[in-house]
């Protein structure tokens, strides 16, 4: 009769996570009597996975009914694999001993590899707004995949992207895997509906990549351009003067005018216009009485957009291109919220 | 602890059934195999053959083609039928537990009846 | 078939050492269980697994196995212990047992 061989049939096994991996073995013979244990790894540090003798195992059951006299099928199913299962597994056969089982043969071993998909990846954009003409980083993670080749793009508005770095840690052999990327993005006056997309592609995801996204709305900052005009109104002593704010982003913004570097009025964007680009146009405007004046008068359109520096414009009235009238009220009439006298 | 009781006709002609019952009494069924042994008057023990609570057998190779074991796990019951008995089935039949122990192969008769007394005769 | 061949009887003083063999084929690769059975009664289980005892069985029956024979040692051998010893073990998916041996206590 043959000496007893333990067979592992399978050098390797390939499983999805959550899944169950079925380890295989037989023996050749029921000779020597003894359990079957199965250990993840070799050597001193080896981790018992299953012992047919003794021991409670909830994520392992047999492929046969053990109990039967004549069983020589000693495969085990592990349920509800993680990556953290990976690695190689030994069946060993052990005959009785006195007072402890002795270790007897051992099969070569099934190296157990798990698919892990990757996390949903996440992008992350810079801290503080940016203007356009500027270059800004973003970030994209995904953690947890195995095994570790992975393929990751860069997309702004459906264009790939080509300025870009990444790094999947760690370097050597591990459970799984995580990948790191920084793209750098040059920005446009027209991005504020733009988005910058992360793809991340892996063989756990069977052709469908994940996709993480930023809208550059939430990066831009776009300043505005300042108009200020005058034209006549009601009256020849009447002036309208109008401050066009065009073309910025976020609409955070507060508008100060000023009489001859003296705050007239402030008032805050409410009622803005957007533009197709997803960038706002604002207008505010005074009602001068020129009679009220005897010099020219300076005028100044000052904005204040999302907390940044102020910019303004400024726009002279020529006082003496419209002569006052003697004993003319100087009580100019307020006609509405953006409408201002000079008095 | 577990007990257990058999009965069974003890008296039979030539060519007819024996056919003997064993109860379990306090103990689990399941888990473990149930054996049934004779021994022929002053002679040794002879196993006849195994059967565990899913109906799984194994038998004695020179008996199996004239043994049938049952079981009936609703009563905690497991039984013998030796068809076509001759004066040379003539013994002491004794039915056993197979102790599974910690390891479920290979393990020793560790609970036995007290045996039945069965007797062919013409 | 594996076959168990076992002396018919031994023979032992009270207080001595008496040593019942029991022999087959690769035997020390088998577990090997033995019973006693007094007359009258049924077989009881003195050893199992080779060499461990089950509860309540007196300290001075010990077993071994090896090679192609076990053995059942009953140290300090006493008047109760007169009965047949058998021996057995597995072949595949049967039991066997061993022809029985007598132990006599003078």
């Known amino acids: 009769e043959e000496e007893l061989q333990v067979i592992q049939p399978d050098k390797s096994v390939l499983v999805a996570a959550g899944e169950t991996a079925t380890l295989r073995c037989t023996a050749t013979s029921l000779i020597p009597v003894g359990p079957i244990q199965w250990f993840r790894g070799a050597g001193p540090g080896r981790e018992l996975i299953y012992n047919q003798k003794e021991g409670h195992f909830p994520r392992v059951t047999t492929v046969s009914d053990l109990t039967k006299r004549n069983n020589m099928d000693f495969s085990i199913r592990i349920g509800n694999i993680t990556p953290a299962d990976a690695g190689t597994y030994y069946c060993v056969k052990f005959r009785k001993g006195s007072p402890d089982d002795v270790e007897f043969k051992s099969g070569a071993g099934t190296e157990l590899s798990v698919r892990a998909k990757p996390s949903a990846p996440v992008v992350s954009g810079p801290a503080a707004r940016a203007t356009p003409q500027h270059t800004v980083s973003f970030t994209c993670e995904s953690h947890g995949f195995s095994p570790r080749d992975i393929t990751l793009k860069w997309f702004k508005n459906g264009n790939e992207l080509s300025d870009f770095q990444t790094n999947v840690d760690p370097v050597g052999e591990s459970v799984s895997y995580s990948i790191h990327s920084t793209a750098k993005v040059v920005l446009t006056r027209e991005d504020v509906h733009s988005q910058v997309i992360c793809e991340v592609a892996h063989v756990t995801l069977q052709g469908d990549p994940l996709r993480g996204t930023a809208n550059l709305s939430e990066t831009i900052r776009v300043p505005p351009t300042l108009e200020v005009t005058q034209q006549p109104v009601r009256a020849e002593n009447q002036v309208n003067v109008t401050c066009q704010v065009r073309k910025f982003y976020p609409q955070r913004l507060q508008l100060t005018w000023l009489e001859n570097g003296n705050v007239s009025r402030t008032e805050t964007a409410s009622t803005v216009t957007e533009n197709k680009d997803g960038t706002y146009n604002w207008m505010s405007w005074l009602l001068v009485n020129v009679s009220a004046h005897r010099d020219d008068v300076k005028l100044t359109c000052q904005v204040e957009h999302d907390g940044q520096p102020a910019v303004s414009k400024s726009h002279d009235l020529k006082v003496s291109a419209h002569p006052k009238e003697q004993g003319s009220n100087t009580a100019a009439e307020n006609t509405g919220s953006n409408e201002r006298n000079i008095y | 602890q577990v007990q257990l009781q058999q009965w069974g006709a003890g008296l039979l002609k030539p060519s007819e059934t024996l056919s003997l019952t064993c109860a379990v009494y306090?103990?689990?069924?399941?888990?473990?195999?149930w054996s049934w042994i004779r021994q022929p008057p002053g002679k040794g023990l002879e196993w006849i053959g195994e059967i565990n609570h899913s109906g799984s057998t194994n038998f004695n190779p020179s008996l199996k083609s004239r043994v049938t074991i049952s079981v009936d796990t609703s009563k905690n019951q497991f039984s013998l039928k030796l068809r076509s008995v001759t004066a040379a089935d003539t013994a002491v039949y004794y039915c056993s537990r197979v102790d599974s122990g910690s390891y479920p192969y290979y393990d020793g008769l560790d609970v036995w009846g007290q045996g039945t007394t069965v007797t062919v005769s013409s | 078939s594996s076959e168990l061949t076992q002396p018919p009887s031994v023979s032992v003083s009270p207080g001595q050492t008496a040593s019942i063999t029991c022999s087959g084929d690769?035997?020390?690769?088998?577990?090997v269980y033995w019973y006693q059975q007094k007359p009258g009664q049924s077989p009881v289980l003195v050893i199992y697994?080779?060499?461990r005892r089950p509860a309540g069985i007196p300290e001075r029956f010990a077993g071994s196995a090896s090679g192609n024979t076990a053995t059942l040692t009953i140290s300090g051998t006493q008047a109760m212990d007169e009965a047949d010893y058998y021996c057995?073990?597995?072949?595949?998916?049967?039991?066997?047992f061993g022809g029985g041996t007598k132990l006599t206590v003078l």
């Open positions: 306090g103990g689990s069924f399941s888990g473990y195999y």
């Open positions: 697994h080779d060499d």
């Open positions: 690769k035997l020390g690769d088998k577990y």
């Open positions: 057995q073990t597995w072949d595949s998916s049967t039991v066997v």
